[in-house]
């Protein structure tokens, strides 16, 4: 079964800046990736970025830079200032859709008591939903 991993890191240089990295461990080709916070996309979560493998990337504040790292992994940097900035216990979710096979989603947050600049290794997070 395909899995999704999520890694959340607070930047050492900007304490309220976060980097979210997500990856898809599966054989299907990815048709769309959706990154959200506050819960899964479509279940109370707010969309931060949508990445299409051919047609580009759309992102919304406080997302600053979303990009493909590999064909099956992405990263997203979040701006840390303002009312809509994330806090240490914010949950971030990534959903990888592989049409018409379905989608796989996992969520993660900053590891407890992590020092700025450090993060947990990108192990597969529990899959919340496999559509």
């Amino acid at each position: 079964t395909p899995e999704v991993w999520v890694q959340v890191r607070m930047e050492a240089t900007e304490l309220s800046s976060f980097t979210i990295r997500c990856g898809f461990l599966g054989s299907g080709s990815i048709s769309l990736v959706t990154v959200s916070w506050g819960g899964p996309n479509g279940a109370g979560g707010t969309t931060l970025a949508v990445l299409h493998p051919e047609r580009g990337i759309r992102q919304w504040a406080p997302a600053r830079q979303a990009r493909w790292e590999t064909q099956s992994s992405i990263s997203l940097i979040l701006e840390g200032s303002g009312a809509s900035s994330p806090c240490a216990n914010t949950t971030f979710c990534c959903k990888f859709a592989s049409f018409p096979e379905g989608s796989w989603e996992a969520c993660g947050s900053l590891p407890p008591s992590s020092d700025p600049g450090l993060s947990a290794p990108p192990t597969p997070a529990p899959i919340l939903r496999a559509d």
């Epitope: 769309l32 047609r55 592989s98 018409p100 379905g102 989608s103």
Partner: antibody
């Protein structure tokens, strides 16, 4: 709650074209798609094609390729379906539906518009 | 002629259980999800079952879906008069590269 509101009924002459609109309210298009499905009087459902408004990508059913154009205006959350070279067999109710092909990788329609009756008659 | 084959009609009495079949091929049901839609008279279709056997919130558990090989079925138990409607199965077809529907089944609740 997502609502899809379609434009009103149309009467068209054979050979002309028709453009039907579908406005989404209660939520943005986001990463979802909009599909168009038609139903001739007393007949079944027929998928025509789809658009992901966020990226402008379209998919069309082979049967309608070259005769249908699906477009979307993201700022107004409105999708459009234009069907050309109309003939009497195109008389049908045309539905827009929110699809989850892009968002969830499956060809499912979870919200539907109320339908627009298009009558093609000379 | 629809790509997916359904019986044109089925009927049952209140409280009974009816099953609507949907037959496809290896390019659609055989390798992709099946969805079921209910269309009450004079209204737009409504999603009833997705991903072969899952119900959206608000759909009573009297409705259940299943899939085996290149066929799928919709079961309606504890039949009620308000279940009288047309039911359509649907799937993605890899050969046609598009969504396909069954021809629809009219469910009549007798008595």
């Amino acid at each position: 709650q997502v609502q899809l509101v379609q434009s009103g009924a149309e009467v068209k002459k054979p050979g002309s074209s028709v453009k039907v609109s579908c406005k989404a309210s209660g939520g943005t298009f986001n990463n979802y798609g909009i599909s168009w499905v038609r139903q001739a009087p007393g007949k079944g459902l027929e998928w025509m094609g789809q658009i992901i408004p966020l990226f402008g990508t379209t998919k069309y059913a082979q049967k309608f390729q070259g005769r249908v154009t699906i477009a979307a205006d993201e700022p107004t959350s409105t999708a459009y379906m234009e069907l050309g070279s109309l003939r009497s067999e195109d008389t049908a109710i045309y539905y827009c539906a929110r699809d989850r092909m892009a968002a969830d990788g499956m060809a499912v329609f979870d919200y539907w518009g109320q339908g627009t009756l298009v009558t093609v008659s000379s | 002629q629809s790509v997916l084959t359904q019986p044109p009609s089925v009927s049952g009495t209140p409280g009974q259980k009816v099953i609507i079949s949907c037959s496809g091929s290896s390019s659609n049901i055989g390798r992709h999800f099946v969805f079921w839609y209910q269309q009450l008279p004079g209204t737009a279709p409504k999603l009833l079952i997705y991903k072969n056997d899952e119900r959206p919130s608000g759909v009573p558990d009297r409705f259940s879906g299943s899939k085996s090989g290149t066929s799928a079925s919709l079961a309606v138990s504890g039949l009620r008069s308000e279940d009288e409607a047309d039911y359509y199965c649907s799937s993605w077809d890899a050969a046609l590269n598009g969504v396909v529907f069954g021809g629809g089944t009219k469910l009549t609740v007798l008595g």
